[in-house]
Amino acid sequence: KSPIFGPEEVNSVEGNSVSITCYYPPTSVNRHTRKYWCRQGARGGCITLISSEGYVSSKYAGRANLTNFPENGTFVVNIAQLSQDDSGRYKCGLGINSRGLSFDVSLEVSQGPGLLNDTKVYTVDLGRTVTINCPFKTENAQKRKSLYKQIGLYPVLVIDSSGYVNPNYTGRIRLDIQGTGQLLFSVVINQLRLSDAGQYLCQAGDDSNSNKKNADLQVLKPEPELVYEDLRGSVTFHCALGPEVANVAKFLCRQSSGENCDVVVNTLGKRAPAFEGRILLNPQDKDGSFSVVITGLRKEDAGRYLCGAHSDGQLQEGSPIQAWQLFVNEESTIPRSPTVVKGVAGGSVAVLCPYNRKESKSIKYWCLWEGAQNGRCPLLVDSEGWVKAQYEGRLSLLEEPGNGTFTVILNQLTSRDAGFYWCLTNGDTLWRTTVEIKIIEGEPNLKVPGNVTAVLGETLKVPCHFPCKFSSYEKYWCKWNNTGCQALPSQDEGPSKAFVNCDENSRLVSLTLNLVTRADEGWYWCGVKQGHFYGETAAVYVAVEERKAAGSRDVSLAKADAAPDEKVLDSGFREIENKAIQDPRLFAEEKAVADTRDQADGSRASVDSGSSEEQGGSSR
């Protein structure tokens, strides 16, 4: 007995499409072996029509596909534009056609529903609008116009020109009579329901001379589009519902048991808690289309999603909808990385961001997710040397360790830095990941002075105290700029006295600036790393002033100036439109705008954006 299972009989009508799902035991071998769909011949052979290895018969060209879902142990054969010639006996199977791992499927394609003579067929999607046109002759121009629906054997009045409207259609139907020149009336039904489907009769006049026209209304429930994405990756649902609902509230919901559809996000500001920090509803285009991006996909995100439009911002009968069935592949190509990173006030975090290693030359970005309205993610830093003004001196994006991972370092943390951040590139949009930064109680591990003032032409020594827990780490000083942090020579001055309960393994490492010049002004970081993996950092701002009295300056922790007040957000902050995040091709345009703004406010002045090789040092 074959372990493959599927539908024994499939029935459809000409012009329609079918989705045939075949189930197989999801063993490792089965998941990766060839899947096929073949037609059984009279003499017992089975001719392949489509396979998972890319073969498509000329009979199926442009109208069929085969999708394997290894995680679920299923594969789906979609066949469109059916004709009666497609009727026959088929097999869906694994491996080689002649072997026994297959299931017999009978497909019968019939001519379609028998319709009355002169019947106009209207095929419309659920939730949309249909206009049924009803011609009449001059003698009935002044007579009553009506539309009936055939319920069983009886016609039931739906609407007429005297003002009657059947209660089932209240608020969503109208009867329009064209100008005197045109012998036509039309009935417009909005927010179509599945129950609206059926045979209709429109009539002008009520006597034996009345004009009648038959109409067959077919209301289609949308076929869910199959979407298969990797665990920890991201998915984008593009929703195009048409211009007629451009000004109606939009939503994305996920079907739970039964017919409930729980709102995931809508344009009225609702968002499901499970998606906090990892969802964006991109602004609508003029035609009413929008898209929803979900990152950090979890196993439990799998399911059926509907997008739609309704004034309530949730699924109601008659909402126009689009549907997707999301499968989340647990055999993910996206590596595990921490989803929560903790730091202390005044301290730092180093976040590892995965990217598709095939796209090492792509531009890397880091943005801060904001939940207001439909969510947005303004960029904070990129790998091309742009840093948002408010983050200068405390944020750096490093290409290291490379080979599929980049690093983002944020220091001088405050409680306001808590939140969700997205790692993304202008390459593979599926590799968007989310990390939550949490600010916890505690003291920074590295101790440095606050602001330091150096004197032109003199020598400055700045200390950094490393506790013994970092004894095995490489310790460094570097000078921060937009493109990273260039390593500087530093001196190990032996054990530090800044830590209680810390033995000889603690360290005081100093940065020495000889013959200070104006160019030495700026942010300096001390930090720890292991190979290409970065740990904690601490930042010091060095100001340079004219000489007052001779001598060199040796800064201690006690002498340090108070930390500067935190900079407040100004109105010129840079934000990538959500659309740009969803479609990296838009980055280039946005970047150009941002660059001119950066130059205008001076934040790019004197930045040498040389290659990482030229910059050398431990941080680039």
């Epitope: 024994e8 499939v10 076929e223 017919e259 059926r304």
Partner: nanobody, 126 residues
Framework: QVQLVESGGGLVQPGGSLRLSCAAS????????MGWFRQAPGKEREFVTA??????????YYADSVKGRFTISRDNARNTVYLQMNSLKPEDTAVYYC?????????????????WGQGTLVTVSS
């Protein structure tokens, strides 16, 4: 909510026939699959047959044990699914349950259907 009511069960001799009906009411427009399961005394509930539909296409599934003997069909207008059982055997004796599922994608053989009827007893005995 969806309500399912089975009928047509009873006593029949081996080799005889029986037709079960399952009438659905409530929010039936969201149903994508209806199936029949059975549970014999002291045994686990098992899949018998199912019918799935999407647009004007339908898909019929059968357990190996009933292939060629049982036929599932659907009357769209009446929101009813039928199970025609021919060549009945004593081992077909069980309580037959009708079930409805909203998803087009779940394996129809699994018992994780969204709605269930109360069941109707079929006894095959001479």
């Amino acid at each position: 909510q969806v309500q399912l009511v089975e009928s047509g069960g009873g006593l029949v001799q081996p080799g005889g026939s029986l037709r079960l009906s399952c009438a659905a009411s409530g929010r039936t427009s969201s149903i994508s699959t209806m199936g029949w399961f059975r549970q014999a005394p002291g045994k686990e509930r098992e899949f018998v047959t199912a019918i799935r539909w999407s647009g004007s296409s339908s898909y019929k599934y059968y357990a190996d044990s009933v292939k060629g003997r049982f036929t599932i069909s659907r009357d769209n207008a009446r929101n009813t699914v039928y199970l025609q059982m021919n060549s009945l055997k004593p081992e077909d004796t069980a309580v037959y349950y009708c079930a409805a599922q909203m998803s087009l994608w779940r394996d129809p053989r699994e018992i994780d259907y969204d709605y269930w009827g109360q069941g109707t007893l079929v006894t095959v005995s001479s």
